[in-house]
């Protein structure tokens, strides 16, 4: 948790005091924000945002869609966050299927994970079709898979996010990449 000099406003404290938390689907999420100047909790995942004016955020039966970033803010505008993964073997990905890239720029395939401890988090072509040999990516369980330096040849590429679960590949819904030329 953050520490500052006496007299200076300090960011709120969150319990549990860790940056990431993994809970199982159906279990309780209980997050406490300790700050005399508490203002609100904010929850964010993909394009969804929710607010809560209670200093204790309680979700009695967690679902995969409760996966995301929980931020507590105080009256000084200072904040602290915890990221919660709700592990659901039946829903490994949260998905926003819009996928646009500009040639030579990176673009994000938005398929954050509900379980950060899965393996082989990667991209697969649709219907077993090969991906471009030069395609490279950066995986981030909280955001998705960033395709590096999108090529014009990737336009209309159909792909899935993929992970391995108990020895089998599990695929997300499909994405179609639209590429804008650089000029």
């Amino acid at each position: 948790q953050p520490s500052v000099s006496p007299g200076e406003p300090s960011p709120p404290s969150i319990h549990p005091g860790k940056s990431d938390l993994i809970v199982r689907v159906g279990d309780e999420i209980r997050l406490l924000c300790t700050d005399p100047g508490f203002v609100k909790w904010t929850f964010e995942i993909l394009d969804e945002t929710n607010e809560n004016k209670q200093n204790e955020w309680i979700t009695e039966k967690a679902e995969a869609t409760n996966t995301g970033k929980y931020t507590c803010t105080n009256k000084h505008g200072l904040s602290n966050s915890i990221y919660v993964f709700v592990r659901d073997p039946a829903k490994l990905f949260l998905v926003d299927r819009s996928l646009y890239g500009k040639e030579d720029n990176d673009t994000l395939v938005r398929c954050p994970l509900t379980d950060p401890e899965v393996t082989n988090y990667s991209l697969k072509g649709c219907q077993g079709k090969p991906l471009p040999k030069d395609l490279r990516f950066i995986p981030d369980p909280k955001a998705g898979i960033m395709i590096k330096s999108v090529k014009r040849a990737y336009h209309r590429l159909c792909l899935h996010c993929s992970v391995d679960q108990e020895g089998k590949s599990v695929l997300s819904e499909k994405f179609i990449l639209k590429v804008r030329p650089a000029f």
């Epitope: 490279r136 950066i138 590096k148």
Partner: nanobody, 126 residues
């Protein structure tokens, strides 16, 4: 330019364990990926495991899943391969590989990695 130095190989009995280390000197970025490959005499170099530097996401060959664990220490620029329940067929020279351009879509293809170590011998006796 990136230099990779492997260590930790040796002779072990079937069922035993070894931990390999690969120390990288040079710049590691968020795009970095480091992996382990192995090559047995007369065979092609094969993928074992890889890890993305930024998020620590892990990738494994089916043949080692559940037995081998790849991990990283960012502060030391080092990647580890913990090998448990070793089998005679795990005998090979183990090579550390790295690339600064991101995880290849075909991360098991050794031709897609730019930097290689000299290798460390692992021998599993029955």
């Amino acid at each position: 330019e990136v230099q990779l130095v492997e260590s930790g190989g040796g002779l072990v009995q079937a069922g035993g364990s070894l931990r390999l280390s690969c120390a990288a000197s040079g710049r590691t970025s968020g795009s970095y990926v480091m992996g382990w490959f192995r090559q047995a005499p007369g065979k092609e170099r094969e993928f074992v495991a890889a890890i993305s530097w930024s998020a620590g996401m892990t990738y494994y060959a089916d043949s080692v899943k559940g037995r081998f664990t790849i991990s990283r220490d960012n502060a030391k620029n080092t990647v580890y391969l913990q090998m448990n329940s070793l089998k005679p067929e795990d005998t090979a020279v183990y090579y550390c590989a790295a690339d600064q351009r991101g995880v290849p879509a075909y991360y098991s293809d050794y031709a897609l990695y730019d930097y290689w170590g000299q290798g460390t011998q692992v021998t599993v006796s029955s």
